[in-house]
Amino acid sequence: FERTRSLQDPCSNCPAGTFCDNNRNQICSPCPPNSFSSAGGQRTCDICRQCKGVFRTRKECSSTSNAECDCTPGFHCLGAGCSMCEQDCKQGQELTKKGCKDCCFGTFNDQKRGICRPWTNCSLDGKSVLVNGTKERDVVCGPSPADLSPGASSVTPPAPAREPGHSPQ
C-alpha cells in the first residue's frame, strides 16, 4: 500500500475516516457504516450520533465527522452540541415543571425560551417609565421626572417636538 509510515507510531498515518488496527500491521481500514473518526491516528471509529425523536438532523454523519442535531419545531436546543431539546413557550411565558406559564406581573420574556425577567427599575437610574412593561416587553425608561415639563405624564409617550412656548394646535 502507498502510505508513508511513521517511525514512532504507524497508526499516526491513518487519516480521518479510518481506524488503525494494531494487530493488522497498522492498516488504515475505513470506518464501518454509521461510524466516524474525525482525527487521524484513531484505533477505533465512534458510532454516529442519531438525531431521533424531538431531535432532527442538521448535518448528516460522515466517515470523518459526527452528525449534528437540532430540535424539531416547537423546541429549542440546550447544552453543548444541542444535547437536549426543551419545549418552546410563547413570548410572555416561561417553562416550568408544569409546562408553560405566563410571566408574573412585573416580569417579562420576549423570547420563546428562557425565564421571565423583572422589568427594568427606571428609578434606579434616576429615570421615569416612558412605556409600561408587559408580559412580553420590558418597560421603556425615559428622561428623569425633573426633565419633563410640568404636568407631563411619566407614562405617556412624548408629544412631537414643537417650538417652546407654543401650544399644540
Epitope: F1, E2, R3, N13, C14, P15, A16, G17, T18, D21, R24, N25, I27, C28, S29, P30, C31, P32, P33, N34, S35, E60, S62, S63, T64, S65
Partner: antibody, heavy 114, light 106 residues
Framework: DVQLVESGGGLVQPGGSRKLSCAAS????????MHWVRQAPEKGLEWVAY????????YYADTVKGRFTISRDNPKNTLFLQMTSLRSEDTAMYYC???????WGQGTTLTVST | QIVLTQSPAIMSASLGEEITLTCSAT?????MHWSQQKSGTSPKLLIY???NLASGVPSRFSGSGSGTFYSLTISSVEAEDAADYYC?????????FGGGTKLEIK
C-alpha cells in the same frame, strides 16, 4: 438523494488504457473515503482500490497494483480510476462505492478484448 | 489475504420459510457486512458490522457471528428476497468478498 454515476467504460484492446469516472452528488463527497469494486460477468464481487477522503491513504488489490491508479477531485465531487496495461481478466462491471459501502453506483462496463 | 467462503452456493427456499446463509473466514475478523444484489442491479448494503440493519432493510433480515463464522438469517422469506447475497470484510487488508449465495424462491 445520494447518487454515484460511473462513466468511461467501453471496449479496450489488451494492453490499452482507460480512465473511469464517478460523479457523486447528494452527500458531502469530501468527507468520505471511496472504493472501486468490480464484478466480472457471471462472477462475484472483487474489491479493487480505496482512497481516503483527503487522498492521503490509498490501497490497491494485488491484482491491479502497479497498473491502476485511484484519485479524486473533491471540489468537483469526482472519483477516478486510471487503468493501464489492461488484460482480458479486467473485463468487468466497475462500481464506485462510498466507504461505508451503503451506496453503490449503477456501474460502468469495461470490456478488454481484441 | 482472508478468504471468505459462503455456503451454500445456491439455496432454494419456499415463501415464509426461515433460512440461514453462512460465511466462514480463514482468519478471525472483527465484524462482517452483508450485501444483497438482485439480478441486473447494483449491490445494496443489507447488514453492517455483523448485526446492524442498514437503512430501509426489513426486520426479517438479521445477522450474527464472531471471529471466523458469521451468518445471515431471513426469518420469513418473501418473493422479493430472490437475489445473490455477499458477505464482505473491511477490517483486514486486502478487503474481500465471499463468493456469494444465490437464493432462489420455489
Amino acid at each position: 438523494d445520494v447518487q454515484l454515476v460511473e462513466s468511461g467504460g467501453g471496449l479496450v484492446q489488451p494492453g490499452g488504457s482507460r480512465k473511469l469516472s464517478c460523479a457523486a452528488s447528494g452527500f458531502s463527497f469530501s468527507s468520505f473515503g471511496m472504493h472501486w469494486v468490480r464484478q466480472a460477468p457471471e462472477k462475484g464481487l472483487e474489491w479493487v482500490a480505496y482512497i481516503s477522503s483527503g487522498s492521503s491513504t490509498i490501497y490497491y488489490a494485488d491484482t491491479v497494483k502497479g497498473r491502476f491508479t485511484i484519485s479524486r477531485d473533491n471540489p468537483k465531487n469526482t472519483l477516478f480510476l486510471q487503468m493501464t496495461s489492461l488484460r482480458s481478466e479486467d473485463t468487468a462491471m466497475y462500481y464506485c462505492v462510498r466507504d461505508w459501502t451503503d451506496y453503490w453506483g449503477q456501474g460502468t462496463t469495461l470490456t478488454v478484448s481484441t | 489475504q482472508i478468504v471468505l467462503t459462503q455456503s451454500p452456493a445456491i439455496m432454494s427456499a419456499s415463501l415464509g420459510e426461515e433460512i440461514t446463509l453462512t460465511c466462514s473466514a480463514t482468519s478471525s475478523v472483527s465484524y462482517m457486512h452483508w450485501s444483497q444484489q438482485k439480478s441486473g442491479t447494483s449491490p445494496k448494503l443489507l447488514i453492517y458490522t455483523t448485526s446492524n440493519l442498514a437503512s430501509g432493510v426489513p426486520s426479517r433480515f438479521s445477522g450474527s457471528g464472531s471471529g471466523t463464522f458469521y451468518s445471515l438469517t431471513i426469518s420469513s422469506v418473501e418473493a422479493e428476497d430472490a437475489a445473490d447475497y455477499y458477505c464482505h470484510q473491511w477490517t483486514t487488508y486486502p478487503w474481500t468478498f465471499g463468493g456469494g449465495t444465490k437464493l432462489e424462491i420455489k
